[in-house]
């Protein structure tokens, strides 16, 4: 009634190990770490067999098969490479996830290395079984922005890709009779969000009520260089239009807004987001130089009043840009207080420009980002948004351009972009 001696499977063992097995003795077959018992095409951790009355074993000894984690999951905006030869996906094999550089980077700066674990899952030391997240790289244009730049007055043509965050916002308010059409600029913050000035998205009413335009009336163009040729640009409709709840038409305080795009836009050399500043009330320091781009008035011979009266919105065909220094709050406040008209430069604004004039933002540039290079992070940061200017012509002497101080609104922006009301799409890195 003895059963034949058992040979343990390769990469496995038998317990208990005895010299002799008699009727009713049982053995448990198990495999080494990283291997599983394979029996009749079924995979299990252990397998039990018994010595029968007739001296035969109840089953054949199963084999031990190496654990296979299978093909790794794809990564949005990323790719996976195999570190092991022959693209092995078995126990202890390694893969590496990476993001589509230079447009995306890995959140938390993890290595992206995953190992096939004994449990059959791809595992990372930090993220465990979770996949990494590829976030858009902000404020790093594929073309380096020029160091020296001489409406937008006194500016110059931007080359394609210099301001990849620049958005053209076109509003065609078909609810008006007759239809009303205007445009402004904005800045891409992520694949789905555009930052702009509230006054760009306020319905151009005959009273001073602040009502946002309907989302159906908003079109956003990204990767645009020349407005006469939109073929290479990405155009998107709006899913939501969000004006700052405290935007004041009388003094343009809180002149900031967001547009959530209907669909996330693909990032590339000509479409990349700008970074948001750290939330701090100081804003950019006086004399710091910033760049601002736009398709607004660039003809110094056309007056703003002529444009307003004619009802046309003369704009530059090719994106223009200018470099301007930040002006101290005290100097700016004083320059506006000396003017007739009720001008208040609040703590939510800062000014930029030259005392002698000649370089400025102008009608049609509204909502565009005033960007400053952050030496610490080596990124361009949206410190301001083109908001308003004095009663004189753009680029006039001692009339500084006024910009929304974005750093005062960072918390509000994150709140809105991550609110349950937002059409759910993607994560945005703080």
């Amino acid at each position: 009634n003895e059963c034949p001696k058992l040979q343990p499977p390769v990469y496995g063992k038998i317990e208990p190990s005895q010299a002799v097995y008699s009727f009713k003795d049982q053995v448990l077959v198990s495999c080494d770490t990283g291997y599983k018992v394979l029996k009749d095409n079924g995979v299990m951790d252990t397998f039990q067999i018994e010595c029968l009355k007739d001296g035969a074993w109840s089953n054949k000894i199963p084999t031990c098969k190496i654990v296979d984690c299978g093909a790794p999951a794809g990564l949005k905006h990323g790719l996976v490479t195999f570190s092991t030869r022959n693209n092995l996906t078995t126990y202890k094999s390694e893969i590496r996830y990476s993001c589509q550089q230079p447009y995306y980077k890995m959140l938390h700066n993890t290595t992206g290395v995953y190992t096939c674990s004994a449990h059959g899952t791809w595992t990372n030391e930090v993220l465990k079984r979770s996949l990494p997240t590829c976030l858009p790289v902000c404020g790093q244009p594929s073309r380096a922005l020029p160091n020296l730049v001489k409406r937008i007055i006194g500016g110059r043509n931007a080359e394609l890709g210099l301001f990849p965050w620049q958005a053209l916002i076109v509003v065609e308010d078909t609810s008006r009779v007759p239809n009303d059409k205007w445009f402004g600029s904005g800045a891409l913050l992520s694949e789905s969000w555009i930052l702009t000035a509230a006054h760009v998205l306020r319905s151009q009413r005959r009273d001073n009520t602040v009502i946002p335009v309907s989302k159906e009336h908003v079109t956003v163009y990204l990767g645009l260089h020349d407005v006469r040729d939109k073929s290479g640009a990405v155009n998107s409709s709006a899913a939501r239009v969000i004006l700052h709840p405290d935007f004041n038409i009388q003094n343009y305080n809180h002149d900031i807004a967001l547009v959530q795009l209907q669909k996330p836009v693909p990032l590339g050399a000509h479409v990349m987001p700008i970074c948001l500043p750290r939330p701090e009330p100081e804003g950019p320091a006086p004399h710091m130089l910033g760049l601002v781009a736009g398709w607004g008035i660039s003809n110094p011979n056309v007056t703003v009043d002529e444009i307003i009266l004619s009802g046309t919105r003369t704009l530059s065909d090719v994106l223009q840009y200018v470099k301007l220094p930040v002006v101290s709050h005290a100097e700016c406040k004083a320059s506006y207080e000396s003017r007739s008209g009720n001008y208040s430069v609040t703590e939510n604004m800062f000014c930029a420009g030259y005392y002698e004039g000649g370089k400025d933002t102008c009608l049609g540039d509204s909502g565009g980002a005033f960007v400053i290079f952050d030496e610490m992070s080596q990124h361009w940061v949206a410190q301001g948004l083109v908001s308003w200017g004095g009663p004189e012509e753009c680029g006039s002497k001692q009339v500084y351009g006024v910009y929304t101080k974005v750093s005062n609104y960072v918390d509000w922006l994150w709140e809105e972009m991550n609110s349950p009301r937002a059409v759910r799409d993607l994560q945005v890195e703080r």
Epitope: S203, R206, D207, I249, V304
Partner: antibody, heavy 114, light 112 residues
């Protein structure tokens, strides 16, 4: 074409309420506020308030806060104004207007008399 | 509250004459940021609804004859009819939309 059609004349008793209607057609109803204006016989125009159909936001002339209630029914593109606790002072023609006063209704005459 | 004062309260002119009427507000109606004065002019003919003529102080509503011109800024505004026609017999109202809305008392235009 754009039209604002107001309900017919009303003869009401003092202390009662009356609900006037203004049916809009020919434009985007939800994107344009509806204004209501009062005109007493032989007198000038007095703004009562407005309602924005997209979200129901209302703004009132302080004088009419307790007198008038503005509502809309988006499904029928109709705006309503209910006047409460009527007195002879409320006898007037009431106009609705929209698309920022580009279009006006023909007016509804309300007469308060016992 | 913003008070709107119109003058004169009535005037009579012959057809073909030029007429001006004034509207003053108790505070400025100019919003510097938008470079707009939030003032409108209306015409109300006998037994009819008011009709918008001018908005933003000087922008003519579509379909309004060019003999009607609005001017002024801040607190002082004027409506000018360059050559009065018989059909211009009406009451003319100004209205501020700087802070909610307030109408002026009206100017009654009669034809001699």
């Amino acid at each position: 074409q754009v039209q604002l059609k107001q309900s017919g004349p009303e003869l009401v008793k003092p202390g009662a309420s009356v609900k006037l209607s203004c049916k809009a057609s020919g434009y985007t109803f939800t994107s344009n506020d509806i204004n209501w204006v009062k005109q007493r016989p032989g007198q000038g125009l007095e703004w009562i308030g407005w309602i924005y159909p997209r979200d129901g936001t209302t703004k009132y002339n302080e004088k009419f806060t307790d007198k008038a209630t503005l509502t809309v029914d988006v499904s029928s593109s109709t705006a309503f104004m209910e006047l409460h606790r009527l007195t002879s002072e409320d006898s007037a023609v009431y106009f609705c207007s929209s698309v920022e006063d580009s279009y006006w209704g023909q007016g509804t005459l309300v007469t308060v008399s016992s | 509250d913003i008070v709107m004062t119109q003058s004169p309260s009535s005037l009579a002119v012959s057809a073909g004459e030029k007429v001006t009427m004034s509207c003053k507000s108790s505070q400025s109606l100019l919003i510097s940021r938008t470079r707009k004065n939030y003032l409108s002019w209306y015409q109300q003919k006998p037994g009819q609804s008011p009709k918008l003529l001018i908005y933003w102080a000087s922008t003519r509503e579509s379909g309004v004859p060019d003999r009607f011109t609005g001017s002024g800024s801040g607190t002082d505004f004027t409506l000018t009819i360059s050559s009065v026609q018989a059909e211009d017999l009406a009451v003319y109202y100004c209205k501020q939309s700087y802070n909610l809305y307030t109408f002026g008392g009206g100017t009654k235009l009669e034809i001699k």
